[in-house]
């Protein structure tokens, strides 16, 4: 999606099938006010951007609102009337899902289920991942919907999750973002804790009677 | 709105191959949204197919992937489903509709054209 | 594959009832299900998409509610034009996959 004419580098995220953020990288015009221009049907006029993102003082992208839309972005970047930069993309590829909300986790004996609210649309996975101090790298499990049960963990262990939701590859093609991981949360004994200590404390010595 | 007229369906040996045509109307299938097929067996419930996005980009039901392939013509705004090694279990009526990406649900659908497998 | 399995098959009912139909997916599809109607020889029409929001133009005795496995179609008083079948549908992931179909007749 980068692509550069002029020099100018650009990156869109569709935020949820929400919001769409177009921003640029023009170091050629890193002190000038680029004008964005849109519109998402090839026959119309073009709108000009309402909602910039600044950078030191300068314009370096636009956000618009494009609820659940699935059709081309079609814009323009201009230095005044000069287009340094035109493009089309569908704007369903750049999708980022939101960050998992109301994550909650209901223990029964060595498994836990994590729930959390699903989004509005289809084609995701929910992605668990956990980890205790004994494990050198994160754990992982993905399901269709926010209901993920992870089994065989240690009763014992204090265990740190997180959760994020990634966009199906075989739906909407490599571009897609994962979402921002929602906070992380750590367990022991079915309980929370504030957190995981980073060094597992070693076993107590049995004391003979 | 979009409008969608299906042609091509008749009968058919097994084995053998058909190509259905959906002519869309007031809307290019390019400019957005997925363009799928839906079928419907005589007398029995609906099935989806396949799509192809306005990207190009294809998805098929893995239980059909193998004999059956979807396409277009941009210029005549016309999408195809080519059907190879017909079964009778194939006979159906099939629908074409208009959806999108992550809301995969059929908002608009032209009238059908019936397939029959039989020898 | 996610099985989609409505209830009942068929019913029978008169003019100014109210008709509920359910449909229960074998695993959680979140809100992502869709009703439609369908009367004989012709396609299907779009009713309710994410459970809960009609259509455009679909009116108001239509409604639709439910999340994660069980879902329902009500038609809050039965009108002539609304004797079809009726068809849930998931598109939490693909394949999608509908239900069987709902015929509701004339007493």
């Known amino acids: 999606q980068g692509g550069a004419a002029e020099g100018v580098q650009i990156q869109i995220i569709y935020f949820n099938l929400e919001t769409v953020q177009v921003t640029w990288n023009a170091s050629k015009y890193s002190r000038t006010n680029l004008t964005f221009h849109y519109r998402f049907n090839g026959d119309e006029a073009y709108d000009q951007c309402t909602n910039y993102l600044l950078q030191e003082g300068h314009t370096s992208g636009c956000l618009l609102d494009a609820e659940q839309r699935d059709d081309i972005l079609y814009f323009s970047i201009r230095n005044g009337t000069h287009p340094v930069f035109t493009a089309s993309r569908w704007m369903v590829y750049y999708l980022k899902p939101s960050s998992p909300k109301h994550v909650r986790f209901s223990w029964h004996q060595d498994a836990v289920t994590v729930t959390c609210s699903d989004l509005s649309y289809g084609d995701l996975l929910y992605e668990v991942q956990y980890r205790s101090p004994f494990d050198t790298e994160w754990q992982s499990k993905q399901e269709n919907t926010c209901n993920v049960t992870i089994e065989g963990l240690d009763a014992e262990k204090c265990y740190s999750f997180w959760v994020r939701v990634k966009a199906m590859e075989d739906v909407y093609g490599p571009d897609t973002y994962p979402s921002d991981w929602s906070e992380v949360t750590c367990w022991q004994r079915g309980e929370i804790r504030d957190a995981c200590a980073e060094t597992p404390t070693p076993p107590k010595p049995k004391l003979s009677k | 709105q979009v409008q969608l007229v299906e042609s091509g369906g008749g009968v058919v040996q097994p084995g053998r191959s058909l190509r259905l045509s959906c002519a869309a109307s007031?809307?290019?299938?390019?400019?957005?949204?997925?363009w799928p097929w839906v079928r419907q067996a005589p007398g029995k419930g609906l099935e989806w197919v396949a799509y192809i996005h306005s990207s190009g980009r294809t998805n098929y039901n893995p239980s059909l992937k193998s004999r059956f392939t979807i396409s277009r013509d941009n210029s005549k705004n016309t999408l195809y489903l080519q059907m190879n090694s017909l079964r009778a279990e194939d006979t159906a009526v099939y629908y074409c509709?208009?959806?999108?990406?992550?809301?995969?649900?059929?908002?608009?659908w032209g009238q059908g054209t019936l397939v029959t497998v039989s020898s | 594959d996610i099985q989609m399995t409505q209830s009942p098959s068929s019913l029978s009912a008169s003019v100014g009832d109210r008709v509920t139909i359910t449909c229960k997916a074998s695993q959680s599809v979140g809100a992502n299900v869709a009703w439609y109607q369908q009367k004989p020889g012709k396609a299907p029409k779009l009713l309710i998409y994410s459970a809960s929001y009609r259509f455009s133009g679909v009116p108001s005795r239509f409604s639709g509610s439910g999340s994660g496995t069980d879902f329902t179609l009500t038609i809050s008083s039965l009108q002539p034009e609304d004797f079809a079948t009726y068809y849930c549908?998931?598109?939490?992931?693909?394949?999608?996959?509908f239900g069987q179909g709902t015929k509701v007749e004339i007493k």
């Open positions: 509709a208009r959806s999108q990406l992550g809301l995969v649900f059929f908002a608009y």
């Open positions: 007031n809307y290019s299938i390019t400019s957005g949204y997925s």
């Open positions: 549908q998931q598109y939490n992931s693909y394949p999608y996959t």
